[in-house]
Interface confidence: medium
Amino acid sequence: DGPAGSWEQLIQERRSHEVNPAAHLTGANSSLTGSGGPLLWETQLGLAFLRGLSYHDGALVVTKAGYYYIYSKVQLGGVGCPLGLASTITHGLYKRTPRYPEELELLVSQQSPCGRATSSSRVWWDSSFLGGVVHLEAGEEVVVRVLDERLVRLRDGTRSYFGAFMV
């Protein structure tokens, strides 16, 4: 009875894992809108997928309440510093909830990447990664914003991405 019970338990755990919501969204040419809105993401092609979560205009939409590990990485780079660049770049994950009219900060990082340009080479690279566990209710949304988004380098789906999975 013991071995059979543990086998059933393993199968049950595997089944529960299979339905655990998860998503990994990747950067695409259309990610940077110039509109001041959140970054947009590829949801199907290449490494991107949605399972048990939905997507709408840059937002991952939670369909099942629970604790989620949410994450985002953005690749930053440029030649020299862009005109009008603020002193710091903000990369953040923000929550939208029907219970509150404004986006709520969940995870935010700030950096001053342009300083990496040198007199001998104006080319610079930097990146920002955010990740953490948060509780999300059904219907709540998570978005990624980068100010100044003009610094985000996309190239392929491996450099800048956004995802979540239930823990």
Partner: antibody
């Protein structure tokens, strides 16, 4: 549609200053750099500098630094280019042009009609 | 600064034929897989008009007979079948770093 409308032709004496305006419409004024480019009669194009109307940040061609001043007025969506200590070789058509949104690729997708500045004693 | 050199200075081509214009930069204008080279057309009494950006991207509203190619320091603008309205002066421009510089222009004239 995007439009850049410049002020009219000017005739100035050597040593004087000129201020050319460029009124933008049809897009979010504070999101795009506005560049200034000049073209002497029968000659090629020369970049003077650019201003980011969002915060007034400027970048200048070293050749014009100290003589050219670029400013932006958000309330009227107008950019100005002032050139001081004019000399005869500054006689040219001066263009304003909208820069692309992505800063690393500063191509100029919309241009003003040009303002002829003549410097003559 | 980056010096842009266009050739030839004048190109005489018959309508319907292909035109190939060249532009060389004094140093590479490539970054992260993109080439920061742009092409403009200018007709007398008019401002320049953007044709091609980042070496090979056709600006909206520009006919498909215009195409751009190249990378590093060498770039080409090709007009596949010349129309009467294509006879003008063409400028290349680098946007890799400021000061943003233009070539001296290639005048495309009717043969």
């Amino acid at each position: 549609q995007v439009q850049l409308v410049q002020s009219g032709a000017e005739v100035k004496k050597p040593g004087a200053s000129v201020k050319v305006s460029c009124k933008a419409s049809g897009y979010t004024f504070t999101s795009y750099n506005v560049h200034w480019v000049r073209q002497a009669p029968g000659q090629g194009l020369e970049w003077i500098g650019a201003v980011y109307p969002g915060n007034g940040d400027t970048s200048y061609n070293q050749k014009f630094k100290g003589r050219a001043t670029l400013t932006a007025d958000k309330s009227t969506s107008t950019v100005y280019m002032e050139l001081s200590s004019l000399r005869s070789e500054d006689t040219a058509v001066y263009y304003c042009a909208r820069g692309s949104y992505y800063y690393t690729s500063s191509y100029f997708d919309h241009w003003g009609q040009g303002t002829l500045v003549t410097v003559s004693s | 600064e980056i010096v842009m050199t266009q050739s030839p200075a004048t190109l005489s081509v018959s309508p319907g034929e292909r035109a190939t214009l060249s532009c060389k930069a004094s140093q590479s204008v490539d970054f992260d897989g993109d080439s920061y080279m742009n092409w403009y057309q200018q007709k007398p009494g008019q401002p320049p008009r953007l044709l091609i950006y980042t070496a090979s991207n056709l600006e909206s509203g520009i006919p498909a007979r215009f195409s751009g190619s190249g990378s590093g320091t060498e770039f080409t603008l090709t007009i596949s079948s010349l129309q009467s309205e294509d006879f003008a002066v063409y400028y290349c421009q680098q946007s890799y770093e400021d000061p943003f510089t233009f070539g001296q222009g290639t005048k495309l004239e009717i043969k």
